[in-house]
């Protein structure tokens, strides 16, 4: 039995997979910040995780997916204050009892040091200094990502 969050996540990812062959993105759109081969959009408003996921989808993007600790640190360096939290594309899958990225892959336990519980209705946020498990209903900011070409495969991280 999938939770509503898992269903929403899977639906959005399936719709994204159908469009992976659209023309590549050469430059970041206005208001988006380039970080290596990605464009990031840091929201100024707040939403629960589900709404944040949907907002990124409407922007033809996804909630942020983080490959490794190095990418995490570079992303955190763009956060201007320690009291700002941002949703990323990682939440707890109750059916698989594991942290799961919205592209379907599971978290490599070495990648992120998560502070907080791994349990139902938990989603992952990042701050300037840490990675937190928060209740998915919490209204905080979020980060969307678009990939720059030549990356044309599915969004990472790979499992």
């Amino acid at each position: 039995q999938k939770s509503s969050i898992e269903k929403c996540s899977v639906d959005i990812q399936q719709s994204r997979n159908k469009t992976t062959e659209r023309p590549g993105l050469l430059n970041c759109p206005i208001y988006w910040q380039q970080l290596r081969e990605k464009c990031l959009l840091f929201s100024h408003t707040v939403n629960p995780w589900n709404n944040s996921l949907a907002d990124c989808s409407t922007k033809e993007s996804s909630l942020l997916l983080i490959r490794d600790k190095d990418e995490l640190i570079h992303t955190q360096n763009l956060i201007r204050d320690k009291a700002i939290l941002f949703w990323i594309g990682l939440n707890f899958s109750l059916s698989e009892k594991n942290w799961k990225w919205i592209n379907g892959s599971f978290l490599n336990s070495n990648d992120l040091e998560i502070r907080g519980d791994a349990k139902e209705n938990s989603c992952i946020s990042i701050s300037q200094t840490s990675v937190y498990s928060e209740y998915c209903s919490t209204e905080i900011r979020w980060i969307c990502q678009k990939e720059l070409t030549p990356v044309r495969n599915k969004v990472y991280p790979d499992s």
């Epitope: 100024h44 707040v46 201007r80 204050d81 320690k82 009291a83 700002i84 939290l85 502070r115 907080g116 519980d117 701050s127 840490s130 937190y132 498990s133 928060e134 209740y135 209903s137 919490t138 209204e139 905080i140």
Partner: antibody
Framework: EVQLVESGGGLVQPGGSLRLSCAAS????????MSWVRQAPGKGLEWVSA????????YYADSVKGRFTISRDNSKNTLYLQMNSLRAEDTAVYYC????????????WGQGTLVTVSS | DIQMTQSPSSLSASVGDRVTITCRAS??????LNWYQQKPGKAPKLLIY???SLQSGVPSRFSGSGSGTDFTLTISSLQPEDLATYYC?????????FGQGTKVEIK
């Protein structure tokens, strides 16, 4: 109806300790950051500390850092402020308020509890 | 830390008057500015958030404007129950800071 009710204030000697509590009801407590704000007699408002919904993340004003500890028990819908090494300048009405992540406003406040630090 | 400066520190006006309180930040805070009302012996109450958004249940005679460093709270027609101290607050960065307050009295 959202309600925040503080308790635990009182008279304490300089160097002493006190623990304030804030009982919350009428909303999903664990989904909200919470803060403590204080007001010295006849003075303005001063933000003291904030804690994230899960309790994993905490922030403090420089004036209380290392002396005060904010915490929460989501199973009891209660916010706490442990105050150690109290000083005369900590004398104030202490309010708990809903909010604390940037850019939250404090949309609900408790009625306040008076802490007096005096010998 | 971001300093918030309100003016005037107090004012006296008649019922029905238009009242304006200003708040200046020591650096740009975009629109991350809130206004609170505190009546004597009571807890503060949120009036305006994000510089110009009226909090639910607050009378429409209250309005806010501004962005960057200069902000204004306006009471379009002062009522007896508006006797209070008004505070601005920035939520752009920690530590969260308040203005020193503006005390509004009724003539």
């Amino acid at each position: 109806e959202v309600q925040l009710v503080e308790s635990g204030g009182g008279l304490v000697q300089p160097g002493g300790s006190l623990r304030l509590s804030c009982a919350a009801s009428g909303f999903t407590f664990s989904s909200y950051a919470m803060s403590w704000v204080r007001q010295a007699p006849g003075k303005g408002l001063e933000w003291v500390s904030a804690i994230s919904g899960s309790g994993g993340s905490t922030y403090y004003a420089d004036s209380v850092k290392g002396r005060f500890t904010i915490s929460r028990d989501n199973s009891k819908n209660t916010l706490y402020l442990q105050m150690n090494s109290l000083r005369a300048e900590d004398t104030a009405v202490y309010y708990c308020a809903r909010g604390g992540y940037l850019p939250d406003a404090f949309d609900y406040w408790g009625q306040g509890t008076l802490v007096t630090v005096s010998s | 830390d971001i300093q918030m400066t309100q003016s005037p520190s107090s004012l006296s006006a008649s019922v029905g008057d238009r009242v304006t309180i200003t708040c200046r930040a020591s650096q740009s805070i975009s629109s991350y500015l809130n206004w609170y009302q505190q009546k004597p012996g009571k807890a503060p109450k949120l009036l305006i958030y994000a510089a110009s958004s009226l909090q639910s249940g607050v009378p429409s005679r209250f309005s806010g404007s501004g962005s960057g460093t200069d902000f204004t709270l306006t009471i379009s027609s002062l009522q007896p129950e508006d006797l209070a101290t008004y505070y601005c607050q920035q939520t752009y960065s920690t530590p969260l800071t308040f203005g020193q307050g503006t005390k509004v009295e009724i003539k």
